[in-house]
Interface confidence: low
């Protein structure tokens, strides 16, 4: 049978089994989510894209799944990230009381996976899926992350932190999920401040990357939304993580502050 050929890689092999297994594991480890029925979660996930044209997925398609995966993060404990996922995840594994989107049920289920279906069939397409650039932006994976990222930002409160990659030419990128979705969905009535941590990724000079033009752009966007903005350089990510793990280490001085220069705006 003829099948549409997309530019992106196909659905991750054993996708249904992976989602179900991840759900079971997550609900076992997180007592507050033990009430979740993983079969219902999979059915809702499947319902968002199965038998639908994969370039015409909407946020509405994911609402049943979002409803089932409703979860709250305590105030001051939300960690957003952009182009530096691995370090953000290493950090929350050590600092157990902070949470990235991928530490929440829905983010955990979908992290690093690809999926799509086909119009009018109940099959999952393991051959190819739409590429965001080459095919379409309204594909199942992109719309999923846009939906859950929006929700994650909307529910954040207190001081929100974001890790940014100082090795990129655009440290803050308006086209990233953080720049295009999360920044605009932080709620000023609940969020007092956004604190950016600019990760130097091994860069060995002492430039203050908080003065980068793209960071100034982020500050401007955030300030216009009546949210205060702070920025810190983290010159040594390895040292930073080490000091989070072991704040008593004599080389860490006053906790994590030893590894970054504080810059207030």
């Amino acid at each position: 049978r003829w099948r549409q050929q997309w530019s992106g890689s196909g659905t991750t092999s054993r996708f249904p089994e992976t989602v179900l297994a991840r759900c079971v594991k997550y609900t076992e480890v997180h007592p507050e989510m033990r009430h979740v029925d993983c079969q219902s979660v999979w059915d809702a996930f499947k319902g968002a894209f199965i038998s639908k044209y994969p370039c015409n997925i909407t946020e509405e398609d994911y609402q049943p799944l979002v409803k089932l995966g409703t979860q709250t993060v305590p105030c001051n404990k939300t960690l957003l990230w952009s182009r530096i996922k691995d370090l953000a995840h290493q950090f929350t594994q050590v600092q157990r009381d902070m949470f990235t989107l991928e530490d929440m049920l829905l983010g955990y289920l979908a992290d690093d996976l690809t999926w799509c279906g086909e119009f009018n069939t109940f099959e999952i397409n393991y051959q190819s899926c739409p590429d965001w650039r080459k095919d379409c932006s309204n594909n199942p994976v992109s719309v999923f992350w846009k939906t859950v990222s929006r929700r994650f930002a909307e529910t954040a409160c207190g001081v929100v932190h974001v890790m940014l990659n100082g090795s990129r030419s655009k440290i803050f990128d308006k086209n990233s999920t953080f720049g295009s979705v999360e920044v605009h969905n932080l709620q000023p009535e609940k969020v007092q401040a956004l604190e950016a941590w600019v990760i130097h990724g091994g860069r060995e000079d002492s430039r203050d990357l908080c003065q980068d033009p793209t960071i100034k752009e982020l500050e401007s966007i955030i300030s216009k939304r009546n949210i205060r903005f702070f920025c810190k350089n983290i010159y040594r990510p390895d040292k930073f993580l080490q000091c989070v793990k072991n704040p008593e280490d004599s080389s860490c001085l006053s906790g994590i502050s030893a590894s970054h220069h504080h810059h207030h705006h």
């Epitope: 691995d86 370090l87 290493q90 990659n165 090795s167 030419s169 990760i199 990724g201 091994g202 860069r203 060995e204 000079d205 002492s206 430039r207 010159y235 040594r236 990510p237 390895d238």
Partner: antibody, heavy 120, light 111 residues
Framework: QVQLVQSGAEVVKPGASVKMSCKAS????????MHWVKEAPGQRLEWIGY????????NYNQKFQGRATLTADTSASTAYMEISSLRSEDTAVYFC?????????????WGQGTLVTVSS | DIVLTQSPATLSLSPGERATISCRAS??????????MHWYQQKPGQPPRLLIY???SRATGIPARFSGSGSGTDFTLTISPLEPEDFAVYYC?????????FGGGTKLEIK
């Protein structure tokens, strides 16, 4: 003492790829950037980019982005550079180099160089 | 990119004389009170060797006859008095901005 030992000379055909290595010893491999520098005949030295083995983070000179790939094997204290779609102008000696450390971004230690000859 | 222009391209001198090599940057390489300009010596078949870092600081083990000066866009490497082993190619390098760039080199040859 700090030592950077690079792999031997390579002769490769245009369009092919080459992967060279740089084995580090005498210091904590994960704590310092490993840079790569190109020296082509009659040309000025060119900085290709670096990898931070501590987290795999890379920073490339735009000119080499896409064709040069920097990786590191922390268990073997070895950094690698792969260059794809080779052409004659890639004929050069490639050096790995380490800087003095945090905020000391000048090249204190160098490998002996790997000569890559692109020839059909 | 910051372009570094070295002059002269070739310098012919005798041992005991004074060598002055200039490096001009297309824009200032000063930051945080430092000139992010460094100097290297390279001999045939060898990697470059760091001589001077941050415009004027001598690297470990480098003799006092090597000195660096300058700020902003204009930097100078001075070698005095010249020893026979100093005849080589000299490069300046900046790391104020990515991509880090090198000058075209100055060949110091025996007259």
């Amino acid at each position: 003492q700090v030592q950077l030992v690079q792999s031997g000379a390579e002769v490769v055909k245009p369009g092919a790829s080459v992967k060279m290595s740089c084995k580090a010893s005498g210091y904590t491999f994960t704590s310092f950037n490993m840079h790569w520098v190109k020296e082509a005949p009659g040309q000025r030295l060119e900085w290709i980019g670096y990898i931070y083995p501590g987290n795999g983070g890379t920073n490339y000179n735009q000119k080499f982005q896409g064709r040069a790939t920097l990786t590191a094997d922390t268990s073997a204290s070895t950094a690698y550079m792969e260059i794809s779609s080779l052409r004659s102008e890639d004929t050069a000696v490639y050096f790995c180099a380490r800087t003095g450390g945090l905020r000391r971004a000048y090249f204190t230690y160098w490998g002996q160089g790997t000569l890559v000859t692109v020839s059909s | 990119d910051i372009v570094l222009t070295q002059s002269p391209a070739t310098l012919s001198l005798s041992p005991g004389e004074r060598a002055t090599i200039s490096c001009r940057a297309s824009e200032s390489v000063d930051s945080y009170g430092n000139g992010f300009m460094h100097w290297y010596q390279q001999k045939p078949g060898q990697p470059p060797r760091l001589l001077i870092y941050l415009a004027s600081s001598r690297a470990t083990g480098i003799p006092a006859r090597f000195s660096g000066s300058g700020s902003g866009t204009d930097f100078t490497l001075t070698i005095s008095p010249l020893e026979p082993e100093d005849f080589a190619v000299y490069y300046c390098q900046q790391n104020k901005e990515d991509p880090w760039t090198f000058g075209g080199g100055t060949k110091l040859e025996i007259k």
